[in-house]
Interface confidence: low
């Protein structure tokens, strides 16, 4: 190979010629043919011939920095090296690196290579620079975080001479009972049901479910979605890239939940569902999926079991009738836990009690959901609480109310079963979290979930 070793000096690039044994050199600025050994002479003001170094003018493209380097092969002039900014490479920083080659977008995100950068288009239920944050947790229709007052509708069906009323606030996923869903009135020509999230949130999906009404399956077969920030001006969710309303597939029976995701997600305070096709009456149970606008509000694993039993500890434990089989251990303090003994209850009712979760690594905690429980029919719950956090498990800081500059007291539960969510803003960044019950009903009793995300990428 005529170009090996490289006959071109001072960083020149050797190009083999058409004829055997011939070559040409592509010389960096400041040098000239035939072997890039001749210095280009630049006339000065005094019209005296002077020599420009290899870095003048700058041979490096795209903002690269030219640095004089050690001599190559004992050339007359010392050579140079281009230090390229992020996103570029090549001898002269002439190549834009394709950042998408290393697949930075997680969870099905679509990568677009930009100049010295990239962007990820995330599926609706994920967000973040690399689609690393999940944003598809239930927003609280089923659990009760979303209160009755937040769920309204165009009409309510009344049956049995008006004795049965299928109110909008019955439209909670998996609701049980004789009247367990919302049904629109028969004469409602354009029915809708609306959720007021009370603040702008990121909504990434919806789960719908029908119900049996008077023994007959009823459900919404397809629907449209609208959203608003003031409850007055509404926008219909469109088919991406068109002006056509998106018609979402609904249910095919009265009980199987069916989920649809929103890509792109909706960012709004109000969400409205408009039934389009109904089996008999328009009857619905539902849940909205999503997260806070900032993202990072996914369950950290109390309910799912990702947080293991050994990570949950407490100040004391209560035993009903002093029997081991009725021990209300900290490991049972998991949101929605079922069974006779399905929560943590403290051994003492005082303000020095605590429930502690070790998240194993420093974690961003942006919210908390609490729930009470029943001990053999006795309703028990924590009505208010404080939070403390620590990184070593020994030195604790009580979470402060920024405005009042004192310990923040979070509002807790008012019954044994409804979820109560509190947003932690600003978030806690710590390994250990403690719930400090401040007031209670019956005995101090907790089921809970922490919301947040692991360390940001």
């Amino acid at each position: 190979d005529i170009c090996d070793p490289n006959p071109c000096e001072n960083g020149g690039i050797c190009l083999p010629g058409l004829a055997d044994g011939s070559f040409s050199c592509e010389c960096p600025d400041g040098f000239t043919d035939p072997n890039c050994s001749s210095v280009v002479e630049v006339a000065s003001d005094e019209e005296e011939p002077t020599s420009a170094g290899p870095c003048t003018p700058n041979p490096c493209h795209n903002g690269g920095t030219c640095e004089i380097s050690e001599a190559y092969r004992g050339d007359t002039f010392i050579g140079y090296v281009c230090k390229c900014p992020r996103g570029f490479n090549g001898i002269h920083c002439q190549h834009n690196i394709n950042e998408c080659e290393v697949e930075p977008c997680k969870n099905g995100g679509i990568c677009t290579d930009l100049v010295a950068n990239y962007s990820c288009e995330c599926p609706g239920e994920f967000m973040g620079r690399n689609c690393q944050y999940k944003c598809s947790g239930p927003l609280g229709i089923e659990g009760g975080i979303i209160s009755n007052q937040q769920i309204t509708a165009s009409s309510t069906h009344r049956a049995l001479f008006g004795l049965q009323k299928w109110y909008p606030y019955y439209a909670r996923l998996n609701k049980k009972g004789l009247i367990n869903a919302w049904t629109a009135a028969e004469n409602d020509r354009w029915p809708w049901i609306q959720i007021n999230l009370q603040r702008k949130m990121r909504v990434t999906g919806v789960i719908t479910q029908g119900a049996k009404r008077i023994g007959s399956p009823e459900y919404i077969k397809s629907y449209k979605i609208a959203y608003s920030n003031d409850g007055k001006t509404w926008a219909m969710y469109k088919v991406k890239g068109t002006n056509e309303d998106m018609v979402f597939r609904g249910n095919i029976d009265n009980n199987t939940p069916y989920a649809n995701s929103f890509t792109p997600p909706i960012k709004a305070q109000y969400v409205r569902l408009y039934p389009q096709v109904c089996r008999r009456h328009c009857t619905l149970r539902m849940e909205l999926l999503g997260c806070e606008l900032s993202g990072c509000s996914e369950p950290l694993g109390m309910k799912s079991g990702h947080i293991q039993d050994y990570q949950i500890t407490a100040s004391s434990i209560f035993r009903t009738l002093n029997m081991d089989m009725f021990t209300w251990e900290p490991r049972k303090a998991r949101l929605d836990k079922q069974g006779k003994v399905n929560a943590w209850t403290s051994g003492h009712n005082d303000q020095s009690q605590w429930l502690q979760v070790d998240l194993l690594v420093p974690t961003k905690v942006t919210g908390i959901i609490t729930q009470g429980a029943k001990d053999f029919g006795h309703v028990q719950f924590v009505g208010s609480y404080k939070l403390a956090y620590s990184n070593d498990g020994e030195h604790w800081t009580v979470y402060q109310d920024e405005k009042q500059r004192k310990d923040k007291v979070f509002q807790g539960n008012f019954d044994n079963d409804t979820h109560r969510k509190n947003v932690i803003d600003p978030p806690i960044y710590a390994r250990h979290i403690r719930i400090l019950p401040w007031s209670w009903y019956g005995r101090i009793t907790l089921r809970s979930e922490l919301l947040g995300c692991t360390e940001e990428e």
Epitope: A184, D188, R189, W190, P191, I214, G215, S216, P217, K221, R249, I252, D253, Y274, P275, Q276, V277, C278, R279, R280, C282
Partner: antibody
Amino acid sequence: EVQLLESGGGLVQPGGSLRLSCAASGFTFSSYAMSWVRQAPGKGLEWVSAISDSGGSTYYADSVKGRFTISRDNSKNTLYLQMNSLRAEDTAVYYCAQEGLITFGGVIVIGYFDYWGQGTLVTVSS
Amino acid sequence: DIQMTQSPSSLSASVGDRVTITCQASQDISNYLNWYQQKPGKAPKLLIYDASNLETGVPSRFSGSGSGTDFTFTISSLQPEDIATYYCQQYDNLPITFGQGTRLEIK
């Protein structure tokens, strides 16, 4: 104009199999639930099976459950009924029917057979 | 399953007569009942839906009424082309069930 055209009927021995097809045209096939309804010679109508618009959900009369399978190919606008372990009492004209959509304001209520094919005769006899 | 009982099973009437067919459900089906007409050698045709609503294009001499378990189908003035078998059908619940049919003849 909505058209439903059944085919695949014929004479088959007891215990045998047959596959009926229903070619649909004149409407958006993938948006509608479909059913098979049969009528034994000189007898009344009997609903046999139904399938949801996507094909994800199927329903059967007790008399055919486990022997008949309803399916659809939305890309071909075709409804199918695979009939196995046929019995003499399965002898009938088989109709495919579109589960109709009656609009009431912004809402549509399901439960009608408003378009039917001309039927195909299935005879099960030795 | 919901049983649908139609009566009479057959009837004979003169042109211009008022004809009434009844259908009884074995349980409450609200108004989730349809009526079909089937002429010999033809597929059934939907006439009435939701117990009392006339399907588009169907002559106004046909009507339906009733709710719960008892339903009535009426032809106010019988025409020669009305010779057919008439079926009621419930869709309150699966399986969908039909009445046994009423055969209508001209005297």
